[in-house]
């Protein structure tokens, strides 16, 4: 308990053999000789009290009764610490000129306290003297009297028997253990402009510090230093900056040292690297300095925008690392000579030149327009003019072709593409006009006749294993019967396709070759003729003229032209009444036969039941004599659409009686209108 009583709770720990050695406790009692009795005359007693380092002594009186005399000249108790007299005490209570301790507590200045008691040769009455108690206690070095310098620069930490200092982030404790020196070396500035200042600016800068700041810019830049706001660095009236100073060093020269209160002038270093050194000593209270630095470089020639272009950003001048871009007006494009640029940005180099030459903003040129198959192009704006906003007009070869997709007017747009009024960049399409014929029908039914040029310009002669026919659709498809080309479905190139001729054996014809054969998936060879329809894709488009013209496909409304007794025309080089293939293209006008009547005609042997299906139509005379025959297979049974005045294919020559033109039997044709979706799908997909 003694330890705790005298030294307080020492951080709650007790000395251990391995732990720190606590100082021996210092405490006790002092009293005048003979206390509590009266003290004798001519007494002199001296006590020297000593506490461990870092501790002080506290003393207070529990009893004090001494003779009172002027300035305590007779009897007194004197308290001293080192050379300093803390108090001279006498009497019982303090007066104007004498002091008695009362309830005061006295503290040594250091770790020692001297107490002297003296009585003179006489006392007028008896005095009982004094009783005092003392103890050692920790000094709180961190507490300082007002006006005194603080113990530590930044943070002070008291502990039993001593104290220590610590520093804020960015500082380090000096060797003197009290001063905080700034950690201010090795700061590097690489931006083209910035600010730097003494530590803590505009508050006083730290003591005992050595700061270095480096400005390091790319070669070609020159640093400019401007001192701003205020400048206050400790100075001396006679010696140049002996205490604190600022120096500026470049690869060319040294500026400074600077100190005092006057802002130094601007420094144009003509260097891309600058080192600023700031050194402070252990004393002083000055606010320091602030520098705003900028940089410059050899400017590049001012960029003049090319015609029809503009520069961005616009600056008063362009120096090293500055850049500009060129943007062209709508309808103009960036060109470096002949080379188109997606974008253009030039950067100013250290020698004062741009890293690339100025491009041109040249008017967009869409170039010569593509040729239009079966059409032509006309320059509207001017002969051969193909630049921005130029207009061209496509047209199709008259009579035999008509334009699809758009009106054929195209404008050269800013993206460099010829563009239609609908925004299409692809060419229009010259689609062959279908269903044109030189023939006029009187409507009477009469015997097979020779066709004249231009009567059946859609007529196609197909030579493969046998002779067959077909009808031209568009300019690269042939519609025919599945049974006519079934054997060649896997060898399309074996088909010899001829058109534009009337004479079967004539050497004067337009040759076409097959690229692919598409047989209806519902057709079964040698098992009836349902879905007897096929398409042949030609490997090249044929040129349309008066002798080669496609047949039209039936419109939705076409049924109204194919009712019972309506006249259709079949044509071909098939067998004639004489039993031979026709040399000249023949045709016959025949009426459509009632479907039930036709079905019934083919229900008796040798025809299997259900031979005539809803995908077929029949035509011919009940009396016979007018019919299509072998060799005509695949040819078109055509009808005139009186609204459009165009011929369309209503049927495909498919099958009939064993003897062509037999009375009571009819020619059976594939009903094309049932296959429009199939035809359109094949053609659009392939």
């Amino acid at each position: 308990m003694r330890l705790l009583t005298l030294l307080g709770l020492l951080c709650g720990s007790v000395a251990t053999p391995l732990g720190p050695k606590w100082p021996e406790p210092v405490f006790g009692r002092l009293a005048s000789p003979g206390f509590p009795g009266e003290y004798a005359n001519d007494q002199e007693r001296r006590w020297t009290l000593t506490a461990p380092p870092g501790y002080r002594l506290r003393l207070y009186f529990t009893h004090f009764d001494l003779e009172l005399s002027h300035l305590c000249e007779y009897d007194f108790v004197k308290l001293s610490s080192g050379a300093k007299v803390l108090a001279t005490l006498c009497g019982q209570e303090s007066t104007d000129t004498e002091r008695a301790p009362g309830k005061d507590t006295f503290y040594s200045l250091g770790s020692s306290l001297d107490i002297t008691f003296r009585s003179d040769y006489s006392n007028e009455k008896p005095f009982t003297g004094f009783e005092a108690f003392y103890a050692a206690e920790d000094i709180d070095e961190c507490q300082v009297a007002p006006g005194e310098a603080p113990t530590c620069d930044h943070h002070c930490h008291n502990h039993l028997g001593g104290f220590y200092c610590s520093c804020r982030a960015g500082y380090v404790l000096h060797r003197n253990k009290r001063t905080c020196s700034a950690l201010c070396s090795g700061q590097v500035f690489t931006q083209r402009s910035g600010e730097l200042s003494s530590p803590e600016y505009p508050r006083p800068y730290p003591k005992l510090s050595s700061c270095t700041y480096s400005i390091s810019l790319e070669e070609g830049f020159s640093v400019i230093l401007d001192f701003v706001e205020s400048f206050d660095v400790e100075t001396h009236p006679e010696t140049l900056c002996p205490y604190d100073f600022l120096k500026i060093q470049t690869d060319r020269e040294e500026h400074g040292p600077f100190c005092g209160k006057t802002l130094p002038h601007r420094i144009e270093t003509k260097s891309n690297t600058v080192t600023i050194t700031f050194v402070t000593d252990e004393s002083g209270d000055h606010t320091g300095w602030k520098i705003h630095y900028t940089s410059t470089a050899q400017p590049c020639p001012y960029p003049m925008a090319p015609p029809n272009g503009h520069v961005s950003p616009v600056q008063a001048k362009y120096i090293l690392k500055d850049s500009f871009s060129i943007f062209c007006e709508t309808g103009y494009e960036l060109l470096q000579g002949h080379l188109p640029l997606k974008s253009f940005t030039a950067v100013c180099q250290k020698d004062g030149s741009w890293d690339r030459p100025m491009p041109a903003c040249s008017i967009v040129d869409c170039g010569p327009p593509d040729d239009l198959p079966s059409g032509r192009v006309e320059y509207i704006t001017g002969p051969g003019v193909t630049t921005y906003k130029a207009v061209i007009q496509y047209s199709c070869e008259e009579t035999f072709y008509t334009m699809k997709v758009n009106d054929g007017k195209y404008v050269c747009e800013a993206d460099g593409f010829w563009t239609s009024s609908k925004g299409e960049k692809s060419l229009p399409v010259c689609e062959p006009v279908c269903g044109l014929s030189a023939r006029t029908t009187g409507g009477r039914i009469y015997g097979g006749q020779k066709a004249k040029p231009g009567d059946f310009p859609w007529q196609v002669l197909i030579l493969g294993g046998t002779t067959a026919a077909g009808a031209l659709l568009y300019d690269n498809w042939v519609l025919t019967a599945a049974h006519a080309v079934y054997e060649q479905k896997h060898d399309a190139s074996a088909l010899d396709i001829r058109m534009g001729t009337l004479k079967r054996l004539s050497p004067h014809y337009t040759q076409a070759w097959s690229e692919a054969v598409f047989i209806h998936e519902g057709y079964t060879h040698d098992a009836g003729f349902d879905n007897d329809i096929a398409l042949i894709k030609l490997n090249n488009k044929v040129v349309i003229n008066s002798n080669i013209t496609p047949i039209c496909l039936p419109r939705k409304e076409a049924e109204s032209f194919m009712r019972t007794d309506d006249i259709g025309t079949a044509s071909g080089w098939g067998l004639t009444q004489r039993g031979f293939l026709a040399r000249n293209l023949m045709y016959v006008d025949i009426p459509i036969v009632d479907h039930q009547k036709c079905t019934a005609a083919y229900e008796k042997p040798p025809y299997p039941r259900g031979s005539v299906t809803a995908n077929m139509l029949c035509a011919g005379l009940e009396s016979g004599g007018k019919d299509s025959c072998r060799g005509d297979s695949g040819g078109a049974l055509v009808f005139l659409d009186s609204e459009t005045e165009r011929w369309f294919v209503g049927g495909i020559v498919s099958w009939g009686s064993m003897n062509c033109g037999e009375a009571g039997q009819y020619g059976v044709y594939t009903k094309v209108i049932n296959y429009i979706p199939w035809i359109e799908n094949i053609i659009s997909d392939f």
Epitope: P306, G337, H338, P340, P357, A360, D365
Partner: antibody, heavy 118, light 112 residues
């Protein structure tokens, strides 16, 4: 039609400068780049650089950068190529050419022979 | 710089016979827009050069169709289907995709 007519032959001493002109006609001068190409006697062709008369912006091959200056006078549709600090190996025929969108060598001047001799 | 290498450097040909000149570049001449900027020039004796072919294979106006160009990337060929007397001269390939523009050494075509 497009024509490029160059100035006449020159004889120069080493260290001197020469300025060759190229007068353009038959098109809008400021719309097309002018290139300069040289051909030493019995040797191949060498591209020196170009200038765009519309902005007077020039670009030179690194080999000639320090010695060549290309300029234009748009008022008379003429391009100039000045070569300084002449050496004997600068003896060559100097051609101006006009480009189009397909390349810089669509049209050629007739050439100017520059002889450098002491 | 892009190096253009022509072969052969000398090409003796019989009149009416075909001729072929090869030109190889040290790097691809394909530009970012998908075009290849390679030209062929003809220089007849005592004359200025003239362009025969641009963009590898396109003939300049007035150039006979017996001349043709082909190739891609870094490998190109100029062909003359039937050499005529007026075809005598030096033929240069030149790349105009990369700066600086560079020429081949030239191929001298002469009649055997």
């Amino acid at each position: 039609q497009v024509q490029l007519v160059q100035s006449g032959a020159e004889v120069k001493k080493p260290g001197a400068s020469v300025k060759v002109s190229c007068k353009a006609s038959g098109y809008t001068f400021t719309d097309y780049y002018i290139n300069w190409v040289r051909q030493a006697p019995g040797q191949g062709l060498e591209w020196m650089g170009w200038i765009f008369p519309g902005s007077e912006s020039a670009y030179h091959s690194e080999k000639f950068k320090a010695r060549v200056t290309m300029t234009v006078d748009t008022s008379i549709s003429t391009a100039y190529m000045e070569l300084s600090r002449l050496r004997s190996d600068d003896t060559a025929v100097y051609y101006c050419t006009r480009g189009d969108r397909s390349g810089p060598f669509a049209y050629w001047g007739q050439g100017t022979l520059v002889t450098v001799s002491s | 710089d892009v190096v253009m290498t022509q072969s052969p450097l000398s090409l003796p040909v019989t009149l009416g016979q075909p001729a072929s000149i090869s030109c190889k570049s040290s790097q691809s001449l394909l530009y970012s827009n998908g075009k290849t900027y390679l030209n062929w020039l003809q220089q007849r004796p005592g004359q200025s050069p003239r362009r025969l072919i641009y963009l590898v294979s396109k003939l300049d106006s007035g150039v006979p169709d017996r001349f043709s160009g082909s190739g891609s990337g870094a490998d190109f060929t100029l062909k003359i289907s039937r050499v005529e007397a007026e075809d005598v001269g030096v033929y240069y390939c030149v790349q105009v995709t990369h700066f600086p523009f560079t020429f081949g050494q030239g191929t001298k075509l002469e009649i055997k």
